[in-house]
Amino acid sequence: IWELKKDVYVVELDWYPDAPGEMVVLTCDTPEEDGITWTLDQSSEVLGSGKTLTIQVKEFGDAGQYTCHKGGEVLSHSLLLLHKKEDGIWSTDILKDQKEPKNKTFLRCEAKNYSGRFTCWWLTTISTDLTFSVKSSRGSSDPQGVTCGAATLSAERVRGDNKEYEYSVECQEDSACPAAEESLPIEVMVDAVHKLKYENYTSSFFIRDIIKPDPPKNLQLKPLKNSRQVEVSWEYPDTWSTPHSYFSLTFCVQVQGKSKREKKDRVFTDKTSATVICRKNASISVRAQDRYYSSSWSEWASVPCS
Amino acid sequence: RNLPVATPDPGMFPCLHHSQNLLRAVSNMLQKARQTLEFYPCTSEEIDHEDITKDKTSTVEACLPLELTKNESCLNSRETSFITNGSCLASRKTSFMMALCLSSIYEDLKMYQVEFKTMNAKLLMDPKRQIFLDQNMLAVIDELMQALNFNSETVPQKSSLEEPDFYKTKIKLCILLHAFRIRAVTIDRVMSYLNAS
């Protein structure tokens, strides 16, 4: 058993049929010695008396808010949560495996630039009685500070018969130099509590590996005389690290119809303009990627050919 | 500690091309190592990230773009002094700081070159003959060093009398390649910045 936060404790259980469970001793936070009784949740049934209560925790029915009273007055609470371990593996029931970029990916993180700010998100099908707490650091043995905000519900989607909820959090490394060469990864830890179930999820990464620029901005087309070709130009996204001559981007320019199966024109360039063939009912799209360290491409920025 | 914006004349920067070749060569070599050593811990997640130039050169700090010198997190650097005559400098007016930056890059390359050559000598003794360093990568390191054209003491190649542990050597190769790739990215960014300035 260990303390998650004040008056909230996590009991780690090996979860298998007829498991013996864990013996837990609860102590009432009071100077009083006599006349103390214990109850669980809203029940008025007295579980025991005295300053301490010893319980055998085997299942979720044994978890919950234990309260010690004296003469009708509440003295203190202890909330017990269960953390299940099945076949030596901690449970991951609360969050959905996003399977990208590999299996068992519960947290996904992205950064728009090298400033040390990044966003992580996760998915769940659970809609109520759910709380998240996020901590982060650079390195684990001698951790350097990363400050994370509160996790918020950022999107709701319908997936077949199920509703899927996306939560996200923004974090900022306390003293980040955009030009630095990272040797210690960022660690992100998410505590998830659903009703009386506790789970924790972690992710470890270098900012350089989670870079995904915003789409290029200000796409403009200029038809070329006596030609099927048009010159398309754009600018670096505002959120990208500066100076741009140091933090350079490379671009992919594509002309395609509405369907992905349609034929296309495609060209890659380090410049902020390119010449492509425009077709009726097609659109020109441009996306960006770090020129020197190939992490993710940005989303597409698009303009119609016409 | 930083690079002034008004540096060489346009088109006078022969090192950009070599630095691009360097990044390409080390990326290819790293990819080859990951594929060939697929049963060794050779991915970014599996290896320890070591920097053999740590406390010996200060490339990131010495080559910091002017725009980032306002960022206090970028300025907790070590002071290091270097020789200041290089052919990539392209103009008499070149600042001391730029010379410091380029000589730091030169020292990085020299250190990695020695490490890679020592390692290759060991790998050539491996009866499995599983992986060797790409001669193209070694040649590209050499070309960039020549383009930088700094006079510097030659570092003797490390020789080892004990029987090499080939497993450890291959792990070390992965560690070196990952670190060198990161440094090659920094070098490419610096050369691009200087070329645009």
Epitope: Q229, E262, K263, V267, D270, I277, R279 | -
Partner: antibody, heavy 118, light 107 residues
Framework: QVQLVQSGAEVKKPGASVKVSCKAS????????LHWVRQAPGQGLEWMGW????????EYAPKFQGRVTMTTDTSTSTAYMELRSLRSDDTAVYYC???????????WGQGTMVTVSS | EIVMTQSPATLSVSPGERATLSCRAP??????LHWYQQKPGQAPRLLIY???QSISGIPARFSGSGSGTEFTLTISSLQSEDFAVYYC?????????FGGGTKVEIK
């Protein structure tokens, strides 16, 4: 599968014209760009131009501008390349090729030998 | 137009050996570079597109790398069926142009 079958070999006199055909099968004809590339005996490859069968748009290499015409007949899924004012250095194998991407060549025809000789 | 230069013109290699073919552009063409193989009496065949992207059905011993002005096609271990002429082609701008070719012959 995608296939391109070209017309047979031709022998032409200098100053004449030649029209080579290329019949496509195995895909929706208007879904791919069609290019023509030629290769003189013992020489390299030379791009001549492309046509979009969907709308008849064309782009020709400057070297052939005014001397070449590329057309398509969607009813028969056939592309044509006509080269006029033939010279002896137009002696080459002419290839048609198709791709969903405009700028490189995925599927090639077997080639048509055109000999220009007096 | 962009004139592509391939080297060497002829490469003599023993079966099982590694072959490295080079293609140069006079200006940066990013990764707009494609490789073809042509055997005598046959049409060319696409091997690699956009400098390093492999084509399904093409053996894994063929790999491409490079960007900007210098590109490489590597055949890791030459098989008898790989002796042919190899062409690079730029797609950075029209007109599309090919290199002069590299003939890979048996040593």
């Amino acid at each position: 599968q995608v296939q391109l079958v070209q017309s047979g070999a031709e022998v032409k006199k200098p100053g004449a014209s030649v029209k080579v055909s290329c019949k496509a099968s195995g895909y929706a004809f208007t879904d791919y760009y069609l290019h023509w590339v030629r290769q003189a005996p013992g020489q390299g490859l030379e791009w001549m131009g492309w046509i979009d069968p969907e709308n008849g748009d064309t782009e020709y290499a400057p070297k052939f501008q005014g001397r070449v015409t590329m057309t398509t007949d969607t009813s028969t899924s056939t592309a044509y390349m006509e080269l006029r004012s033939l010279r002896s250095d137009d002696t080459a194998v002419y290839y048609c090729n198709a791709n969903k991407e405009l700028r490189y060549f995925d599927v090639w025809g077997q080639g048509t030998m055109v000999t220009v000789s007096s | 137009e962009i004139v592509m230069t391939q080297s060497p013109a002829t490469l003599s290699v023993s079966p099982g050996e590694r072959a490295t073919l080079s293609c140069r552009a006079p200006q940066s063409i990013s990764i707009n570079l494609h490789w073809y193989q042509q055997k005598p009496g046959q049409a060319p065949r696409l091997l690699i597109y956009f400098a390093s992207q492999s084509i399904s059905g093409i053996p894994a011993r063929f790999s491409g790398s490079g960007s900007g002005t210098e590109f490489t096609l590597t055949i890791s271990s030459l098989q008898s069926e790989d002796f042919a002429v190899y062409y690079c082609q730029q797609s950075n701008s029209f007109p599309l142009t090919f290199g002069g070719g590299t003939k890979v012959e048996i040593k």
